[in-house]
Amino acid sequence: CRTSECCFQDPPYPDADSGSASGPRDLRCYRISSDRYECSWQYEGPTAGVSHFLRCCLSSGRCCYFAAGSATRLQFSDQAGVSVLYTVTLWVESWARNQTEKSPEVTLQLYNSVKYEPPLGDIKVSKLAGQLRMEWETPDNQVGAEVQFRHRTPSSPWKLGDCGPQDDDTESCLCPLEMNVAQEFQLRRRQLGSQGSSWSKWSSPVCVPPENPPQPQVRFSVEQLGQDGRRRLTLKEQPTQLELPEGCQGLAPGTEVTYRLQLHMLSCPCKAKATRTLHLGKMPYLSGAAYNVAVISSNQFGPGLNQTWHIPADTHTEPVALNISVGTNGTTMYWPARAQSMTYCIEWQPVGQDGGLATCSLTAPQDPDPAGMATYSWSRESGAMGQEKCYYITIFASAHPEKLTLWSTVLSTYHFGGNASAAGTPHHVSVKNHSLDSVSVDWAPSLLSTCPGVLKEYVVRCRDEDSKQVSEHPVQPTETQVTLSGLRAGVAYTVQVRADTAWLRGVWSQPQRFSIEVQVSD
């Protein structure tokens, strides 16, 4: 027989399996080119003086052999007499020390037995029900695979695992996930359902961080609001270094833990962008708005546990900075402009209600008017601040409204909405005798008094119905009582009260008639 052919004769040794524990095993055969094939196997035991023979039986029942000598790998062509298009049964017989040792048989169609590629390119790693899920695109035109993985941690050797059969354009594997240590994974594939097919090489390492990314130690402090309407957020952190398995040291793609600072500006919900994520370590400047700040540690699986802080709004108010004029067409606010081409966010919310009920309006970028003021107007029909109640107003400004960290606070103040003149009219005005020539007038607090800084004063008016003389008495906004003296017994008087703001004169209450009875001596 020619060495390049499978010899259809009896092999040159007796046919008897010694049944020993040593011998050939793990036979793998595959196609290596259009017309060539290769079989390889392992040999367990002393190798001195061992001769290997690759045996092949065709579906017709005819059998042949290739003599491999001491080699454990053998190549042959499609012209070697082995039927490659049809199923054949192959095994190895090793002749040593006057005995024959046989490997387990493999039955396969050599023509289709190609060595698969390992997972190539991007292996996506995610977490699924406490396990690790790896997913990759099946290498083109190699659908139908068995997949294995091996994994190790910085302190443990490789452990082998099975991903099970795969039969789709994407393949996946569920693997164990470690809570607190990084792991290195590698994957390999072989043809599904083909006995004796060869495993691919191992894939490049897939480095996987622990399920729980280490938490940073963070402390925040917020400075006072400066003249520019901004305050600095400062923080400190000590990131933890992760110990990595051997194949992940150096670059270690996949095991990185990143710490990010997520700012959520709670105020001014009508602006374009409410959240901004920054690298931890940058020191952002904030407006006087309320913020939620989170430090998010994340790894390949996405965010881990985060630490969240609430930064309350700076509630320092400047009641004089805002000028409000109410006209027949609507209401206009004026305030000192910040700079050229500024966008302003005017936010208002009824006092005493949840912050979630804040309403706001964003102005188009505007330049200061000749008086250096910025303005915002609204009509009565718009319904803005139309209810007769106290509103807390904050105005924010930004030259770049799309950038969350560039907003500043212009002012915060209170405003009474709707028809403040009428709504502020004091009710329940009552008059009580105080002495022979004086009375005590008191009233229920004006609704304007619920609005800090809005009520400038009360004015009490007393009119002598006989002489038509009128006297007016200013009363502090914190008081709801005044004593009128110098009155004459038997004269009819009417008393009225009104509540004034810095910009508006109030509406008089209903006239209250009274007189001091003439005292008759016995």
Partner: nanobody, 127 residues
Framework: EVQLVESGGGLVQTGGSLRLSCAAS????????MGWFRQTPGKERESVGE??????????ADSVKGRFTISRANAKNTITMYLQMNSLKSEDTAVYYC??????????????????WGQGTQVTVSS
């Protein structure tokens, strides 16, 4: 699903050359191999050859060995297989069909191993 469309057929003189193309679209990553078959009136469809796509390994029927060459080109979501036919003979006159299989146990000489087929293109070799 996989769609196959052949092109390039026509009339050619004996000894001449022709190149057929077969464009596969659809779920092409799942295709294991693509082959060429031919059929003349009143006869069974016979294998011309096949290419295993992931490796480029080819098989040829004895009647075309040395004259015909199968190759393939991969693009995004499409695979094009070519059949370069040289030294054409009158017995090569037939309708040529492109086929694709998704299983790893297929025998390239058997038509029933292929799940997908093209509509065919006529090749006529005249003397």
């Amino acid at each position: 699903e996989v769609q196959l469309v052949e092109s390039g057929g026509g009339l050619v003189q004996t000894g001449g050359s022709l190149r057929l193309s077969c464009a596969a679209s659809g779920r092409t990553p799942s295709i294991v191999a693509m082959g060429w078959f031919r059929q003349t009136p009143g006869k069974e469809r016979e294998s011309v050859g096949e290419i295993i796509l992931s490796k480029g390994f080819t098989y040829y029927a004895d009647s075309v060995k040395g004259r015909f060459t199968i190759s393939r080109a991969n693009a995004k979501n499409t695979i094009t297989m070519y059949l370069q036919m040289n030294s054409l003979k009158s017995e090569d006159t037939a309708v040529y069909y492109c086929a694709a299989r998704q299983n790893w146990s297929g025998n390239p000489t058997r038509t029933n191993e292929y799940e997908y087929w093209g509509q065919g293109t006529q090749v006529t070799v005249s003397s």
